[in-house]
Amino acid sequence: EPPTACREKQYLINSQCCSLCQPGQKLVSDCTEFTETECLPCGESEFLDTWNRETHCHQHKYCDPNLGLRVQQKGTSETDTICTCEEGWHCTSEACESCVLHRSCSPGFGVKQIATGVSDTICEPCPVGFFSNVSSAFEKCHPWTSCETKDLVVQQAGTNKTDVVCGPQDRLRA
């Protein structure tokens, strides 16, 4: 009685259960009454990452430097190439098919999380007591200068974009 279902890593064809090709190999010929499944290794720059019955291997992803991409991990016969972005850039999607320049945090905002090859800069508004006076992809919000510790007084209040201005204390005359 011909099988209607096959074991794991097998497939049903012509009323027979044939072994799938292992990762890194493609199908040449289905198994027959006389032979096991015939598989061949994927070529250079090709891969298959699952047990399969594919007659063609997939091409490794190309990390196009014109799109700001570079190779993070070279592909093998069983894995695809992983691309990432050049320094200062990050991927536009999970598949990392192109890159955009890291965003800078405007004055009044500081860097909460520095960008990586796959994620953009995360900015946060500088809370009271902190400021940022530059547009930067690295600078956090800095605390206002503490005039007191310098034996000075605040002459001009700080904002989220400016530091306080300290000055000498007015001496009280007797």
Partner: antibody
């Protein structure tokens, strides 16, 4: 439908090289394997060698040194070449597909001077 | 090279009677993937061989159910439950587990 047809020289002189072509139709040689069998008059079947779909070859231990099997997928042909023939190589030569029951009609090759 | 030894060499049988042919291998025919590639052919006089049984016990399409195959490892048997006149010819066992593939020497079945 699936067909295999051998074409050979019929008569070959001792010490010469035999060339037989198996022309197939109804399937692609890149996806199916073909092997060769011969049968001397009044004797049994002898497996000679095969051409796998992927292009690799296997040969009988006793014939390996003088046998070459090749294919031209675009022409749907598998070729057998055997050197240094003797009278013992007189036989019907068959090409066979490695699934089902697809045999050529066979071609008789006589080695004689 | 793997040897397949068939017995008997000649088998005279009365029509309607059963017949049995043995095929012994010089090593196990079980493949690494668990398949056993032992097959049986019939070659009628003046014809090409015809596949009867593949992988020990599977009847090829169009083969009458009076033919059956059995065995494992190194010992295999072809049985004909009731011999008919059209069964006359030479029976060959064949293996395709190990390269080079091989045929047995043949068993000639004739009617008594």
């Amino acid at each position: 439908q699936v067909q295999l047809q051998e074409s050979g020289p019929g008569l070959v002189k001792p010490s010469e090289t035999l060339s037989i072509t198996c022309t197939v139709s109804g399937f692609s040689l890149s996806r199916y394997s073909v092997y060769w069998v011969r049968q001397p008059p009044g004797k049994g079947l002898e497996w000679m060698g095969m051409m796998w779909g992927g292009g690799s070859t296997d040969y009988s231990t006793s014939l390996k040194s003088r046998l070459t099997i090749s294919k031209d997928t675009s022409k749907s042909q598998v070729s057998l070449k055997m050197s240094s023939l003797t009278a013992a190589d007189t036989a019907v030569y068959y090409c066979v597909r490695t699934d089902g029951d697809y045999w050529g009609q066979g071609t008789l090759v006589t080695v004689s001077s | 090279e793997l040897q397949l030894t068939q017995s008997p060499l000649s088998l005279p049988v009365t029509l309607g009677q059963p017949a049995s042919i043995s095929c012994r291998s010089s090593q196990s025919l079980a493949s690494s993937q668990g398949n056993t590639y032992l097959h049986w052919y019939l070659q009628r006089p003046g014809q090409s061989p015809r596949l009867l049984i593949y992988k020990v016990s599977n009847r090829f399409s169009g083969v009458p159910d009076r033919f059956s195959g059995s065995g494992s490892g190194t010992d295999f048997t072809l049985k004909i439950s009731r011999v008919e006149a059209e069964d006359v010819g030479v029976y060959y066992c064949s293996q395709s587990t190990h390269v080079p593939w091989t045929f047995g020497g043949g068993t000639k079945l004739e009617i008594k």
